[in-house]
């Protein structure tokens, strides 16, 4: 049997050591003890007696099935306790009585059916994070379960086999910053929602099949809900249940952000928000994020005209990796307040982008992200986007463009352009001179000779440049990142010719450690202030005797340098 390894500050690691019991020889000097991934099965009343100053105890996945009632009695300083993924089929309040300093408690993934016969947590007045429940057996939430807890930063409840929710069970916690609920279906959703309306600021619903969700008015008085964010992850919706969910929004008037992540819509987008009051109550929602939305019949999807009015005040929309091939012109025109639009990892092509960015589309748009779509022509893309009079930032990275032409048109206010990972081999005057930030990293560039008078930041890492670009091309450059190219040297003159340069990241290049380069680095201790990844990323590639040495440490041979 292996032993614990402890460092000088009392942090002890005993993970995966095949322990079959809590190891002996524990001391008061220990501050943190991790015994995860062992086969401990049992914790006796004296096993942790000596650990009076322990602040962190991690016992996850250690096959524990029995803990004596007073096993933790000496752990009054404990702040973090992780008992997740063990074999505890029942929980005892006597474990937690002495743990008055506890801030974090994870009981998730143990096969209990309830949280015990009496309240577990009345003494845990400092608790900030609580994780409970499991996938298969946790079936009942009762009113006594959360007694004594008044405020939590994070509460995560995995109740994927829930059969009974006693109303008002969650109401006793007056303030919950982030509640994550894993519910397999919507049976108790309305009851739970009513109980958390006045306490939860961010509600995250996971793995819930909402296909049969039906709204009914909540038994609550006029309530001012603090909820600002609502997220659905791994949920299933239909057109009908989406309409029903919208009706919940009348109770959360301060909601500003809605997120759908990895959800499935078994519908066609035939939404019909019947309640006209829903429209006005969506008024404060500024951010809508949709990622990996799976629509089995996406090719029959509606034009969403029924929800146009819902989204008129939204400022930020992300629809990522969801097979979007068109935002209809009339929809774009309705998005009057939209400032940020991210359509990464979709199926947009120039022909449909032209319809999406029609005259009057997205009139307030400042940032457009079209990364990893199916755009091919930089010239066409720029031309299509001329309608966006307020566009300052464009990301068209990870599209495979045809060679760049000599001239292109771009929205006149554009200041930021991301062309990284687009396969470009040459930069031409197609790139607008108005730019302040240009990202051309991860391409096939072996030179850069474009005059950009306003450029402040140039990102050109992972290319094939052999030298730093000429400083006269960028008179106001502040930041250049040119890692992982084929740069072999830089000199005092080169760096000095960038009058405003504050940050240069040039590590992981093929430096030839010549007398000149090494004497320059030795004579210039101030390099550390400008080279952000200095000295560890600056290694000699040649001559062979210095290969792999840091520039900072390499010493030129007297013979070579004084011939």
């Amino acid at each position: 049997q292996e032993s614990l390894s402890c460092d000088a500050s009392g942090v002890c690691d005993g993970r995966s050591r095949s322990f079959t019991s809590i190891p002996s020889g524990l001391t008061a000097a220990m501050k943190s003890l991790d015994l995860s991934f062992n086969k401990i099965t049992y914790i006796g009343h004296g096993d942790l007696r000596a650990c009076a100053n322990l602040q962190v105890l991690i016992l996850k996945s250690s096959r524990i099935n029995t803990i004596e009632g007073d096993a933790f009695y000496s752990l009054g300083s404990l702040e973090h306790l992780d008992l997740s993924d063990n074999h505890l089929s029942s929980l005892s309040s006597s474990w937690f009585g002495p743990l008055s300093s506890l801030k974090y408690l994870n009981l998730m993934g143990n096969p209990y059916q309830t949280l015990g016969v009496t309240s577990l947590f009345p003494n845990l007045t400092n608790l900030q994070t609580l994780r409970i429940g499991n996938v298969e057996t946790f079936s009942e939430i009762r009113r006594i379960d959360f007694a004594g807890l008044t405020s939590l930063n994070e509460l995560e409840i995995k109740a994927l086999s829930l059969r009974n929710y006693q109303s008002q069970s969650l109401k006793s916690i007056r303030d919950i910053h982030h509640l994550t609920l894993h519910l397999s279906e919507s049976a108790f959703l309305l009851e739970i929602f009513a109980d958390i309306l006045s306490s939860v600021r961010y509600l995250e619903l996971r793995d819930t099949n909402l296909a049969r969700f039906q709204f009914s008015p909540l038994p609550v008085d006029e309530v001012s809900s603090p909820m600002k964010k609502l997220a659905f992850r791994g949920s299933v919706l239909t057109d009908e249940s989406f309409n029903e969910l919208l009706k919940l929004l009348r109770y959360i008037l301060e909601l500003s952000e809605v997120e759908f992540d990895d959800c499935t819509l078994n519908g066609l987008g035939d939404f019909n928000p019947s309640e006209s009051d829903v429209v006005s109550e969506l008024g404060k929602v500024e951010t809508v994020t949709i990622r990996r939305l799976h629509i089995p019949q996406f090719y029959l999807f509606y034009d969403l005209s029924t929800v146009y009015s819902l989204l008129e005040k939204v400022k930020r929309i992300t629809v990522e990796n969801s097979k979007v091939f068109l935002v209809p012109c009339s929809f774009s025109q309705h998005l009057k307040s939209l400032e940020f639009l991210d359509l990464s990892e979709n199926l947009m092509v120039e022909e449909y982008l032209k319809n999406s960015a029609c005259k009057g589309a997205w009139p307030s748009l400042q940032t457009l992200v079209l990364s990893q779509n199916h755009l091919r022509s930089m010239q066409k893309t720029g031309e299509i986007l001329l309608t966006l009079k307020n566009l300052t930032s464009l990301d068209i990275s990870r599209n495979t463009f045809h060679p760049m032409p000599d001239s292109c048109q771009w929205p006149e206010k554009m200041r930021f352009l991301n062309l990284s990972s687009t396969g470009i081999r040459v930069v031409k005057t197609c790139i607008p001179q108005t730019l302040e930030v240009l990202d051309v990293s991860n391409n096939n560039l072996d030179s850069f000779s474009l005059f950009l008078p306003r450029l402040q930041e140039l990102y050109i890492s992972r290319n094939k440049l052999k030298t730093l670009p000429d400083a006269s091309l960028f008179p106001v450059l502040l930041v250049m990142k040119i890692r992982e190219n084929a740069v072999s040297t830089f000199s005092k003159d080169q760096l000095g010719s960038f009058p405003k340069l504050e940050t240069l990241e040039a590590g992981d290049n093929h430096f030839v450690c010549s007398c000149e380069l090494l004497s320059f680095t030795m004579e210039t201790p101030a390099l550390a202030q400008i080279l952000v990844d200095w000295p560890d990323s600056y290694l000699c590639d040649s001559p062979p005797r210095l290969h792999g040495h840091r520039l900072q440490d390499a010493r030129p041979s007297v013979l070579e340098c004084h011939q």
């Epitope: 057996t137 994927l160 086999s161 996971r206 992850r233 791994g234 299933v236 990895d262 078994n266 089995p296």
Partner: nanobody, 122 residues
Amino acid sequence: VQLVKSGGGGLVQAGGSLRLSCAASGRTFSRYVMGWFRQAPGKEREFVAVINRSGGSTDYAASVKGRFTIARDNAKNTVYLEMTSLEPEDTAVYYCAAGEYYTGSSSRYDHWGQGTPVTVSS
């Protein structure tokens, strides 16, 4: 959906590995949550692992967490269970199941495979 073909089971020594697979017929495979359950001789059927429709969420019984991995390939209509560091206590008949709900409760699964025996010898 019909769970038509299970395979990959057999006899293995303690510490060894196996990969179970379960293939479905029909075009609606990606609309189902998939789970693996097991039943040892003389014992009740118990939950092993579950995966959501896209493969983005997975959950495991505490007894297998860190040793078993569930995965799915919607293009091949197949769900897998990669089992490593096998122990004699893992000996059981393993069943795949399809349902509408992401849960470890076997009663919520509507479609079941025929079962694959796994024997782990010490």
